[in-house]
């Protein structure tokens, strides 16, 4: 297992609709054709695998398990979007990248993106 650098933004604020997007960029030492991306959440004394996708370079990311994630890849960048977030989902979201094929296997883990989620205030009753 060889180490690889992964960069991601330090902080992201989710939209009022509970959507947060960030870029996960990895320094690929070679020409990988199969890449696995996993998003981990660290907060509330828990570590959660939020979503995971394995993709072939140039193809769309496919997430399993009715995932709250979607994403696209472009070169050594993965554009991740997490939706359906609630205030209780606030936490540190860590991007983990694995170069699966061809060998050798490379693993990179980012420092994490702190995603802040604020539940929207209910709309006040209006006479109009």
């Amino acid at each position: 297992c060889k180490a690889m650098h992964v960069a991601q933004p330090a902080v992201v604020l989710a939209s009022s609709r509970g959507i947060a997007s960030f870029v996960c960029e990895y320094a690929s030492p070679g020409k990988a054709t199969e890449v696995r991306v996993t998003v981990l959440r660290q907060a509330d004394s828990q570590v959660t695998e939020v979503c995971a996708a394995t993709y072939m370079m140039g193809n769309e990311l496919t997430f399993l398990d009715d995932s709250i994630c979607t994403g696209t890849s472009s070169g050594n960048q993965v554009n991740l979007t997490i939706q359906g977030l609630r205030a209780m989902d606030t936490g540190l979201y860590i991007c983990k990248v694995e170069l699966m094929y061809p060998p050798p296997y490379y693993l990179g883990i980012g420092n994490g993106t702190q995603i802040y989620v604020i539940d929207p205030e209910p709309c006040p009753d209006s006479d109009f």
């Epitope: 959440r41 907060a43 509330d44 828990q46 959660t48 695998e49 939020v50 979503c51 995971a52 399993l64 398990d65 009715d66 995932s67 709250i68 997490i82 977030l85 609630r86 209780m88 989902d89 936490g91 979201y93």
Partner: nanobody, 126 residues
């Protein structure tokens, strides 16, 4: 309605291992995330681990990460909790529960789960 029945709890020495099982009945079992919680004497119930519908995604409490492994066999409608390097503080009644909604969450809280089973007692002696 999904019903969950836990088994496998027993008395074990510190450093030992146990595997808990949670058998489910109900047609919708494979559509839901399932989780384990525990309650020690005189303490509040706490989240332990969870696993997504297909078994590809997992969540762990920091206190058990690296020691416990959650898995599921959808063909057998069963979820497992493999517990290694057990400590006296792992002594508790362990419960299996079903997530209230289809899909997978970023965070896991006991309020998100229902259909808890009756529990199985795990006692770790020093």
């Amino acid at each position: 309605e999904v019903q969950l029945v836990e088994s496998g709890g027993q008395l074990v020495q510190a450093g030992g291992s146990l595997r808990l099982s949670c058998a489910a009945t109900g047609r919708t079992y494979n559509s839901y995330s399932l989780g384990w919680s525990r309650q020690a004497p005189g303490k509040e119930r706490e989240f332990v681990a969870a696993i997504s519908a297909s078994g590809t995604l997992r969540a762990y409490a920091d206190s058990v990460k690296g020691r416990f492994t959650i898995s599921r066999d959808n063909a057998k409608n069963t979820v497992y909790l493999q517990m290694n390097s057990l400590k006296p503080e792992d002594t508790a009644v362990y419960y299996c529960g079903r997530h209230r909604s289809v899909g997978w969450r970023a965070s896991h809280h006991l309020s998100d789960y229902d259909n808890w089973g009756q529990g199985t007692q795990v006692t770790v002696s020093s």
